[in-house]
């Protein structure tokens, strides 16, 4: 039976005498009138058992005291403590060839636990040793024993275990207590690696090299090692472990987010509070759930707020020009909370008689700058139908508004579209060149929109440019342009009006005149 | 759910003291608990905690004063030398899983250490 | 570690008035906001009465309010009652770490 003793965290017992309840029954040789166990009381009145001899008056000594089998629990080194007094041979009258003041240590590997005899030249000698302090007869009679420490080291051992050897020489010794022990690197936790029980080296200066492994719920960032140094302290660690997502470190273990929070990635990083408008119900959360209502776009990361598709736009103002619109509006009061906001146009064309009875505008209609995606808070409708219904929708969209789209994300207008001008006329002609006239022609406008009442010819000499200019309006589809300048260069433009009013001028067509009559057909372009 | 501290009495001091914390109505493997402390007539005191996995956690001032322990259903703390400043009403409580806090706490068992 | 200060560490109100305690951290709490209030009244075991800063426990009147963050953070108790008469104690988290404030004691008059 064996009571607990206190040692260092880093020391492992092998054998202690003190701890040891009843007779320790070593073996001694001789038998008898050597080492002859004694018990003690130490200085908390507990009984010990120890070993004494005192033969200092006989000459030629050779006392052996044999501890039980030791087994070496895979050390390779062990150390041995002796706590003993021993008796200062000049306080002892008559005894000056005969008494000494140290013994010896020995030891012996064996894999038998059940050797019962000593057999001397079997042991190996570990040292001489002899005590610091020594006492005297006065010491004796004040109760002061002076209790000596000494240590020694043995290995590499290699057999399943040894047997210890006292051997005495002449000297008044007291055994009070003998400790066998090894030394180990105790289970440790650093970085977040785990590493085991170490046994140290065989050598004094070894260093055993040891993987740690992850504590639950991390991974290693990058192979965590120590170092079990000899004294059985940890050195040098090196690499890492991290905690997984949804854990955090604390107090050396990684421990799950707790509701509310989260972590997204294996880092160092505590975890974060759920950001704005998302929770976690439970422990452990890599992400956090979005409110009802609210999303997080695919590309938006889990540190995010979750946002909402934005309000609709306001204050929407239409402003008609004939076939054309222009629609201006405010950025919504709620944009979700999200800064990409863009807008999208939605064109309906609608019946007179039913606004119901909406289909989509097509592709003949135009939008400046673009339909879809907007930037900016207005756009330009062209190439409308006159006369026509329209409704205009505008869509305010942000990175979630996929989601969860909603009527409450769009403003609408309709509008009806005034009769239109005519559309510009794409081909003049210069029939016949004078020197003093020309004589044009040209095709009606693809685009009329309504009954062309006459045509306007707009001409001006080149060099001019355009300062100074006449104009000649006729219902008919030619004109002789008469009173011109013989060798010069005229430019000539024609529109359509109907009672919507003027369409565009045509593209320029430039003539020279000439100094003898000829009949030359222009297209538009430069005619001589 | 409950908890309830046993085990408090008169010590001597230096004479080792544990006190038992016992839980109802939860498991201990889904909860850490603390043991949290208050002197006659003074504030509370947070001395450790006793983490899920069965790791332990002290206050500084609390180091090798203290030594928290669990089974199944108790938590123990074991005052390892007592001193007369030791004495105090100790409460054991439950750490919350939505907050960094006690959501359970037991009614206090009274440690008086005098010689 | 993080140091609790409780101010003021006692206070008198009148029935129906109101009561401000604060609370402040030597550095910021975990996740600026892991601060709890508990009130204990003589002979009993402390009770939460409000988590996460300014969320109020599970029926706790709300006439119990918390607010603040980082490391100032403030326990206003308005129309008091008698049973209101108790020490209010603030608990920070950080760094593995628990600490109470030292506690304030209310009266009510």
């Known amino acids: 039976v064996t009571g607990s003793r206190v040692y260092p965290a880093n020391e492992v017992t092998l054998l202690d005498s003190r701890s040891v309840q009843g007779e320790l029954g070593w073996i001694a040789s001789p038998l008898e009138g050597g080492w002859e166990e004694v018990s003690i009381m130490d200085e908390k009145n507990t009984p010990i058992r120890t070993y004494q001899v005192c033969n200092v008056m006989e000459p030629s000594q050779n006392n052996w005291l044999r501890t039980d089998w030791i087994t070496r629990e895979g050390a390779q080194r062990v150390y041995i403590e002796i706590k003993f007094t021993l008796r200062d041979c000049n306080s002892l009258p008559g005894v000056m060839g005969t008494c000494k003041e140290t013994f010896n240590l020995y030891y012996y590997e064996s894999d038998n636990d059940k050797e019962r005899f000593i057999r001397e030249n079997q042991f190996v000698k570990i040292d001489t040793i002899a005590a610091d302090e020594s006492f005297t007869q006065v010491d004796i009679g004040d109760r002061i024993m002076k209790l000596n420490t000494e240590i020694r080291d043995v290995g590499p051992l290699s057999k399943k275990g040894f047997y210890l050897a006292f051997q005495d020489v002449g000297a008044c010794i007291a055994l009070v207590s003998v400790r066998v022990f090894y030394k180990k690197c105790p289970l440790t936790v650093r970085n977040l690696a785990q590493f085991p029980d170490t046994i140290t080296g065989a050598d004094t200066s070894s260093l055993v090299e040891v993987r740690g492994s992850c504590v639950n719920n991390s991974e290693e960032k990058d192979v965590p090692k120590m170092y079990c140094g000899a004294d059985g302290e940890w050195l040098v660690p090196i690499g890492n472990c991290l905690c997984n997502a949804g854990h955090e470190e604390r107090s050396g273990e990684c421990q799950a987010c707790k509701i509310g929070y989260y972590k997204a990635l294996s880092t160092d990083a505590t975890c974060a509070k759920c950001p704005p408008h998302s929770y976690s119900v439970w422990e452990g959360a890599t992400s956090c759930t979005c409110d009802r209502g609210f999303f997080r776009a695919d590309n938006d990361a889990a540190s995010m707020p979750c946002t909402r598709p934005p309000s609709a736009p306001l204050n929407l103002i239409s402003n008609v020009n004939e076939t054309s619109v222009n629609l201006e509006w405010s950025s919504p009061q709620n944009t979700g909370g999200r800064q990409d906001i863009s807008y999208n146009v939605v064109c309906k064309k609608c019946g007179a008689g039913d606004p119901s009875k909406c289909r989509p505008c097509g592709s003949g209609v135009h939008y400046t700058p673009q339909q879809n995606g907007l930037k900016t808070t207005k756009v330009s409708i062209t190439d409308l139908l006159a006369h026509t219904n329209y409704t205009f929708e505008i869509w305010a969209v942000n990175g979630v508004s996929k989601y969860n789209p909603s009527p409450d994300q769009s403003v609408s207008v309709t509008v009806t579209t005034n009769q239109a001008a005519p559309s510009s006329i794409a081909l003049v002609q210069a029939k016949e060149v004078t020197r003093y006239s020309v004589a044009l022609a040209w095709l009606e406008p693809d685009r009329p929109n309504g009954v062309i009442l006459e045509y306007e010819v707009k001409y001006y000499e080149k060099d001019q440019n355009e300062r100074s200019y006449r104009i000649v309006r006729t219902a008919a589809r030619n004109t002789d342009i008469k009173g011109l300048n013989p060798l010069t260069s005229y430019v000539f433009h024609v529109r359509a009006r109907t009672a919507a009013g003027y369409g565009d001028f045509s593209e320029p067509l430039e003539v020279t005149t000439n100094t003898v009559p000829s009949r030359i057909i222009g297209d538009g372009a430069n005619s001589t | 759910q409950s908890v309830e501290e046993s085990g408090g009495r008169l010590v001597t001091p230096g004479t080792p003291l544990t006190l038992t914390c016992t839980v109802s109505?939860?498991?201990?493997?889904?909860?850490?608990m603390s043991w949290v402390r208050q002197a006659p007539g003074k504030g509370l005191e947070w001395i450790g905690i006793?983490?899920?996995?069965?790791n332990t956690y002290s206050a500084n001032w609390a180091k090798g004063r203290f030594t928290i322990s669990k089974t199944s259903t108790t938590v123990d703390l074991k005052i390892t030398s007592p001193t007369t400043e030791d004495t105090a009403t100790y409460f054991c409580?439950?750490?919350?899983?939505?907050?960094?806090?006690?959501?359970?706490w037991g009614p206090g068992t009274l440690v008086t250490v005098s010689s | 570690y993080v140091m609790m200060t409780q101010t003021p560490s006692s206070v008198s109100a009148a029935v129906g008035g109101t009561v401000t305690i604060n609370c402040q951290a030597s550095q910021s709490v975990y996740g600026n906001n892991e601060l709890a209030w508990y009130q204990q009244k003589p002979g009993q075991r402390p009770k939460l009465l409000i988590y996460?800063?300014?969320t109020l426990a599970s029926g706790v009147p709300s006439r119990f309010k918390g607010s603040g963050s980082g490391t100032e953070f403030t326990l206003t108790i308005s129309d008091l009652e008698c049973a209101d008469a108790a020490t209010y104690y603030c608990?920070?988290?950080?760094?593995?770490?628990?600490?109470f404030g030292g506690g304030t004691k209310v009266e009510i008059k």
């Open positions: 608990l920070g988290y950080k760094s593995d770490d628990y600490t």
């Open positions: 996460r800063a300014s």
């Open positions: 109505g939860f498991s201990l493997s889904s909860y850490h």
């Open positions: 006793i983490y899920r996995s069965g």
């Open positions: 409580a439950r750490e919350s899983s939505t907050f960094y806090g006690m959501d359970l």
